[in-house]
């Protein structure tokens, strides 16, 4: 990696997570430089010979790209000039997890930064009232998780209560034999209460809320990626 710049430039990366089977982004920014023809971006992965991706002279140079990344990487070419060296990674695989380095050279100087990329599966939970059950119950389903997450229930009225005795959680392997469908049923629920189903692994935490009243059912769900 030849260096022509005289100074070190600031390069910033963000630990991020990839959802297997979907597209992901490895984030990297640097001090902007209007001289595009002088910008070189190199992405490397620890333990891998060859490059993940190289961008120089305004275009991709994939002559040294490792075969496991062939056809799966792209930079945001129109954003490079404003200091965006982030890498788009198509069809994220479990094996994409690891330590990546973002190397930058511009007419102002050079710099690099590492990032930890975690891979797994995570999805939004959906809670529904299970009218088929003998007593009124709630069914929380999330289609794709990996590694196997923990599932916990909470209630607005019974704060701090342990629902493990009145809930049942199962994990069903999906057809690709990696990710799993999460199903958790909470029994003996009471009306006019808000219940939360929380699914968490070391990559993400997802929460589904449901409020059941006499007249309506209100739902809300959110997903948060965990940085560490």
């Amino acid at each position: 990696f030849g260096i022509s710049g005289k100074h070190f430039i600031t390069v910033t990366t963000f630990t991020s997570a990839g959802n297997i089977g979907e597209d992901g982004t490895l984030s990297c920014t640097f001090e902007p430089d209007i001289k595009l023809n002088g910008i070189v971006i190199q992405w490397l992965k620890e333990g891998i010979k060859g490059l993940v991706h190289e961008f120089k002279e305004g275009k991709d140079d994939l002559s040294q790209q490792h075969e496991m990344f062939r056809g799966r990487t792209a930079v945001f070419a129109d954003q490079v000039v404003v200091g965006n060296a982030s890498l788009r990674l198509k069809n994220v695989q479990l094996t994409d997890a690891g330590t990546y380095t973002c190397y930058i050279r511009t007419s102002k100087g050079k710099g690099n930064a590492n990032l930890e990329y975690k891979t797994g599966a995570f999805s939004m939970p959906e809670i529904n009232v299970d009218y088929n059950a003998s007593s009124e119950s709630l069914r929380c389903e999330a289609p794709r998780w990996f590694p196997q997450p923990t599932v916990a229930w909470a209630s607005q009225v019974d704060q701090g209560a342990n629902f493990s005795e009145v809930s049942n959680t199962s994990f069903e392997l999906n057809s690709e034999n990696v990710t799993m469908k999460v199903v958790s049923v909470l029994y003996n629920v009471t009306i006019n209460n808000t219940y939360s189903c929380m699914i968490e692994n070391d990559i993400a935490k997802a929460t589904g809320d449901i409020k059941v009243t006499d007249s309506e059912v209100k739902r809300r769900s959110q997903l948060q990626l965990l940085n560490s």
């Epitope: 001289k35 595009l36 305004g58 070419a77 954003q79 000039v81 404003v82 200091g83």
Partner: antibody, heavy 117, light 107 residues
Framework: QLQLQESGPGLVKPSETLSLTCTVS??????????WSWIRQPPGKGLEWIGS???????YYNPSLKSRVTISVDTSKNQFSLKLSSVTAADTAVYYC?????????WGQGTMVIVSS | DIQMTQSPSSLSASVGDRVTITCRAS??????LNWYQQKPGKAPKLLIY???SLQSGVPSRFSGSGSGTDFTLTISSLQPEDFATYYC?????????FGGGTKVEIK
């Protein structure tokens, strides 16, 4: 949506300094990384890039004008400015401010500046 | 400086015609070529960026192609509102430079 508006005197005397301000509305000038730019167009002619500035203060000028140009930014006022010194009749043009990434996607409507005694 | 040469400098066409404008750079600019439309008394409007990406809100009859030194702007079916002057611009190496323009007039 984001809008840019040029302002400044429409008439400048030869050898004096042309001063224009671009006010950004509908968004913060420092909310993201952009090249806040000036472009000019003499009557009946083509477009010429004058220069650009980042909110960090880094400036980039057209070498043909560099000795006479100063571009500055005032984030507190959401404005950036152009100063062009020692003007001549050849500097008579419509002056545009614009926002750029690697393309100029938002433009002001332009202001005509005539250099004449 | 990178010189941008547009051709033709003007052309006459009718509504419904397919119109092609070319732009040549004096050296390779990869895909950092943008196209603008300008109507009299108005500011230029971005049509195409990165040689072929259509700017949001621009009709799909506009398309761009090319890389390196040779680029093309195509209007597949000219509409009355398309009569204007078109400029190419490179953002590969400062100073950013524009082509001389192509004026599209009514035949």
């Amino acid at each position: 949506q984001l809008q840019l508006q040029e302002s400044g005197p429409g008439l400048v005397k030869p050898s004096e300094t042309l001063s224009l301000t671009c006010t950004v509305s509908g968004g913060s000038i420092s909310s993201s990384v952009y090249y806040w730019s000036w472009i000019r167009q003499p009557p009946g002619k083509g477009l010429e890039w004058i220069g650009s500035i980042l909110v960090s203060g880094s400036t980039y000028y057209n070498p043909s004008l560099k000795s006479r140009v100063t571009i500055s930014v005032d984030t507190s006022k959401n404005q950036f400015s152009l100063k062009l010194s020692s003007v001549t009749a050849a500097d008579t043009a419509v002056y545009y401010c614009a926002r750029a990434v690697s393309f100029l996607d938002v433009w002001g409507q332009g202001t005509m500046v005539i250099v004449s005694s | 400086d990178i010189q941008m040469t547009q051709s033709p400098s003007s052309l006459s066409a009718s509504v419904g015609d397919r119109v092609t404008i070319t732009c040549r750079a004096s050296q390779s600019i990869s895909s950092y070529l943008n196209w603008y439309q300008q109507k009299p008394g108005k500011a230029p409007k971005l049509l195409i960026y990165g040689a072929s990406s259509l700017q949001s809100g621009v009709p799909s009859r506009f398309s761009g192609s090319g890389s390196g030194t040779d680029f093309t702007l195509t209007i597949s079916s000219l509409q009355p509102e398309d009569f204007a002057t078109y400029y190419c611009q490179q953002s590969y190496d400062p100073p950013w430079t524009f082509g001389g323009g192509t004026k599209v007039e009514i035949k």
